[in-house]
């Protein structure tokens, strides 16, 4: 049940992480102009990832995409490729995590299987997160070491007539969209992580039990596959001791692929 | 059609208070920044105050800041320009302006006289 | 404050000549977000509030006959009639648009020789 929870958790988590990276990668709100401590312009200036705006006191805004690809800052199309990253993980992870869900039957599929996709999709979110937050703090600095630029000459001119006030930009909404969707879709991940672990068949493994009946005999392989005699039902992962039934290298355990989570 | 009608001018003594309204038709006037501009006697125009597009952010001259107040009611469609502590020199034609393209003044009224004298 | 310079203050014409109206502004009124710049012209008749001509410097207002043109940025600007007409005699003012508080220059009369 707790991990019913734990793994439904984690996807809803995710699931709105990844909604916000998408939202703050199609926000045109990265960068705003500075107000404080600045002359009062009658029009407010913001930029995306995708295109820059101009809003008016007279309520009109004016918005112009990135037509070029090759004159844009490097920078830029870094983030822009961290956020893209980001979303197509973020998607993946989503649509491999619906499948993992404990509550959603498809198929016979088996709770290894379950486990592994879960690990799969909590990796996925995890790296989906950390590309945006890593995108988003990319830019940000980029627009700390812009502002002190421009602070620094800010008012430039000739023949000490101010000529041009310099626009400043600080961080825009779309930075904090930024970092606590990425943040979410990291917890997110780690959550789905956490559940993967109580999927995974913790209990010993077992090569063979060999169980000799009068009438015939039964094998049972570890796993639990359901065996004819109509009781096989409820030897799944468990130790068979029952008369006769001998089991072998009782103590001996082997490593499963989610012992290091 | 556009159309801007002010009214609420008139003779007031100095130190005295004058509402000026702006009747708003044609257009959601919410929507639109929106400002009072007057012409002085010298046939000087100054910029009284703007309120802004789809916001209710104000902006006055240094001035007149504390003295004139803009604001709109978007049930009536009506803009006011509410003077106080009024002085000679703020007698003028005061229009009411809708803001267009570049912040520039597109539609003006036909102006409503306020004389500030004693 | 942004001081709007207009010259001339007065200009006689003759019907048909070429009219250049000069405004200068003591601050860039160009917006680098969208690259363009914040001055307006207007065009006042005796009796009658301003009417708009040119906005953002060099942009027609829908109307406005094309012997008017705006031209200039960052901090000098120009508006030309190519062939004054009898109906253009008015007093014509530019306007800064950028900067609160919003400005005008003081006027250029446009009149018959």
């Known amino acids: 049940m707790a991990v019913t929870a734990c793994q439904g958790l984690g996807f809803v988590v995710s699931l709105i992480g990844i909604a916000g990276i998408i939202a703050a990668t199609c926000m045109d709100q990265w960068s705003t102009q500075d107000l404080y401590n600045n002359p009062v312009t009658a029009v407010f200036n913001y930029q995306g990832l995708w295109r820059s705006c101009v809003r008016e006191s007279s309520g009109f805004t004016e918005c112009r995409g990135y037509f070029t690809l090759l004159g844009l800052p490097a920078m830029l199309q870094a983030v822009r490729a961290l956020m893209i990253v980001g979303i197509v993980l973020g998607a993946i992870g989503l649509l491999v995590s619906i499948f993992a869900l404990k509550c959603i039957r498809i198929g016979s599929m088996e709770d290894s299987a379950k486990a592994n996709m879960t690990l799969t999709s909590g990796i996925m979110f995890i790296v989906s997160g950390l590309c945006a937050i890593a995108g988003v703090s990319v830019f940000a600095n980029m627009l700390v070491t812009n502002f002190w630029m421009s602070t620094a000459n800010m008012y430039t001119g000739m023949g000490g007539m101010v000529q041009t006030v310099q626009t400043r930009y600080t961080f825009g909404a779309a930075l904090f969209v930024g970092w606590v969707a990425g943040g979410l879709t990291l917890i997110g991940g780690v959550m789905m992580c956490i559940a993967c672990r109580g999927l995974a068949p913790e209990e010993t493994n077992y090569k063979a039990v060999s169980y000799h009946a009068s009438g015939h005999s039964v094998a049972y392989k570890p796993g639990g596959f359901k065996a004819s005699t109509g009781f096989g039902s409820n030897t799944k992962n468990k130790k068979i001791y029952d008369g006769g039934a001998r089991t072998e290298d009782e103590v001996q355990s082997y490593p499963s692929k989610h012992d290091y989570v | 059609e556009v159309q801007l009608v002010e009214s609420g001018g008139g003779l007031v003594k100095p130190g005295g208070s004058l509402k000026l309204s702006c009747a708003v038709s044609?257009?959601?006037?919410?929507?639109?920044?929106m400002s009072w501009v007057r012409q002085t006697p010298e046939k000087r125009l100054e910029w009284v105050a703007t309120i802004i597009g789809g916001g209710s952010s104000t902006y006055y001259p240094d001035s007149l800041k504390g003295r004139f107040t803009i604001s709109r009611d978007n049930a009536k469609n009506n803009l006011y320009l509410q003077m106080s502590s009024l002085r000679s020199e703020d007698t003028a034609l005061y229009y009411c302006?809708?803001?267009?393209?570049?912040?520039?003044?597109?539609?003006w009224g036909q102006g409503t006289l306020v004389t500030v004298s004693a | 404050d942004i001081v709007m310079t207009q010259s001339p203050s007065s200009l006689t014409v003759t019907a048909g000549e070429k009219v250049t109206v000069s405004c200068k502004s003591s601050?860039?009124?160009?917006?680098?977000?969208?690259?363009?710049?914040?001055l307006t012209w207007y065009q006042q008749k005796p009796g009658q509030p301003p009417k708009l001509l040119i906005y953002?410097?060099?942009t027609r207002e829908s109307g406005v006959p094309d012997r008017f043109t705006g031209s200039g940025s960052g901090t000098d600007f120009t508006l030309t009639i190519s062939s004054v007409q009898a109906e253009d005699l008015a007093v014509y003012y530019c306007?800064?648009?950028?900067?609160?508080?919003?400005?005008f220059g003081a006027g250029t009369k446009l009149e018959l020789k």
């Open positions: 953002w410097a060099s």
């Open positions: 302006v809708r803001l267009y393209f570049g912040n520039s003044f597109a539609y």
């Open positions: 601050q860039s009124l160009s917006n680098s977000g969208n690259q363009r710049n914040y």
């Open positions: 044609g257009f959601t006037i919410n929507n639109y920044g």
């Open positions: 306007q800064n648009n950028y900067f609160y508080p919003l400005t």
